[in-house]
């Protein structure tokens, strides 16, 4: 069996065995090693010498196997745009930014560039659940039957009405989309404004 070629090695068809960790160098028609994440090319390869890599300086990074002669500059997240760092930049990874909780991404250019506050959903409604959270503003939908939500909030969920009988109580006033059922002790008289409803 043929020995495995080690960079630099000649390539007639302009392709390399390991596309992730090697690249084709057209000047010499050879395959050379890429530099691993966190490093850059400090000396290019030749027919007799493979790529020489060096570690990225502080506040710079390269995320992938590469043949870049520089490292990318770390960029801070912009809190004015609602973005916040959730993990710092390292030599192998750029600063990880995310919209602050309760915000959604309002502008996207390869990555999020601007976040805005989620709109409140008024009483009687809740935010429709999305497959991908943080990608769009709230769309408020009415509480389904038998549920209520009594605040203006971007995140409050509709809750089921209390079932008075489960607590050994009776219903004094039915629940609405904006309020829970009112329960009372079965021995208590109804409030005066409801006393007329006892007939039949």
């Amino acid at each position: 069996s043929q020995p495995q070629a080690v960079p630099p090695y000649a390539s007639e068809n302009q392709t390399c065995r390991d596309q992730e960790k090697e690249y084709y160098e057209p000047q010499h028609r050879i395959c050379c090693s890429r530099c691993p994440p966190g490093t850059y090319v400090s000396a290019k390869c030749s027919r007799i010498r493979d790529t020489v890599c060096a570690t990225c300086a502080e506040n710079s990074y390269n995320e992938h196997w590469n043949y870049l002669t520089i490292c990318q500059l770390c960029r801070p997240c912009d809190p004015v745009m609602g973005l916040e760092e959730i993990a710092p930049c390292t030599s192998k990874r750029k600063t990880q930014c995310r919209c602050q909780p309760g915000m959604f991404c309002a502008a996207w250019a390869l990555e999020c560039t601007h976040c805005e506050l989620l709109s409140d959903c008024p009483p009687g409604t809740e935010a429709e659940l999305k497959d991908e959270v943080g990608k769009g503003n709230n769309h408020c939908v009415p509480c389904k039957a038998g549920h209520f939500q009594n605040t203006s909030s971007p995140s409050a969920r509709c809750q089921p009405h209390t079932r008075c009988e489960n607590q050994g109580l009776v219903e004094a006033a039915p629940g609405t989309a904006q309020s829970d059922t009112t329960c009372k002790n079965p021995l208590e008289p109804l409030p005066p404004e409801m006393s007329g409803t006892m007939l039949m």
Partner: antibody, heavy 115, light 107 residues
């Protein structure tokens, strides 16, 4: 190196008040949400309160709303928690944490509520 | 509020074991989830953010997966220093919430 140092804990009677502080260094304080998290002895972690980077938005867990007030001074790199009407169930170690995903934590300050 | 339900609440394992801890959110949180390790008398330390991204300096035996409502923390080969309590936390929306914790003890 990020450092978060809490102070202000102590023994207080039920109904009493206490002001906790957190001194931050080693990062751009004004770029991060800052939070208070508490942990009662032998219990789990509970988020208490948070404040947005500019200080314009504050958030609280339901059990402390109306009793606790979070504030920050971006010029001095400090985070405060004013606690009033303290209850026995508020007794815990209170820890200051950087960022809404709690990237870094302080060591905490103990709050004891007892008569 | 988003409830985070962690299971199991405790487990016994031996060095070298593969350990899996699960966390379920009461509603979808996309990938806005972190995992923390806490040892007695110490502050928590974050291991994973965005559900699956490993924090700098955290050993590669730790990994996270999941999206939406179901998440997993896996320790591929438990080491002596991994005996601790682990918490999940969602940061999709306020109030920020933690799971109840999973104590990993020596068998």
């Amino acid at each position: 190196e990020v450092q978060l140092v809490e102070s202000g804990g102590g023994l207080v009677q039920p109904g009493g008040s206490l002001r906790l502080s957190c001194a931050a260094s080693g990062f751009t304080f004004s770029s991060y949400t800052m939070n208070w998290v508490r942990q009662a002895p032998g219990k789990g972690l509970e988020w208490v309160s948070g404040v947005a980077p500019s200080g314009d938005r504050t958030y609280y867990t339901d059990s402390v709303k109306g009793r606790f007030t979070i504030s920050r001074d971006n010029a001095k790199n400090t985070l405060d928690l004013q606690m009033t009407s303290l209850r026995a169930e508020d007794a815990a170690i209170y820890i200051c944490a950087q960022g809404f995903a709690f990237t870094n934590w302080g060591q905490g300050t103990m709050v004891t509520v007892s008569s | 509020d988003i409830q985070m339900t962690q299971s199991p609440s405790s487990l016994s394992a031996s060095v070298g074991d593969r350990v899996t801890i699960t966390c379920r959110a009461s509603q979808g949180i996309s990938s806005a989830l972190a995992w923390f390790q806490q040892k007695p008398g110490k502050a928590p330390k974050r291991l994973i953010f965005d559900a699956s991204s490993l924090d700098s300096g955290v050993p590669s035996r730790f990994s996270g997966s999941g999206s939406g409502t179901d998440f997993t923390l896996t320790i591929s080969s438990l080491q002596p220093e991994d005996f601790a309590t682990y918490y999940c936390q969602q940061y999709n929306n306020y109030p920020l919430t933690f799971g109840g914790g999973t104590k990993v003890e020596m068998k």
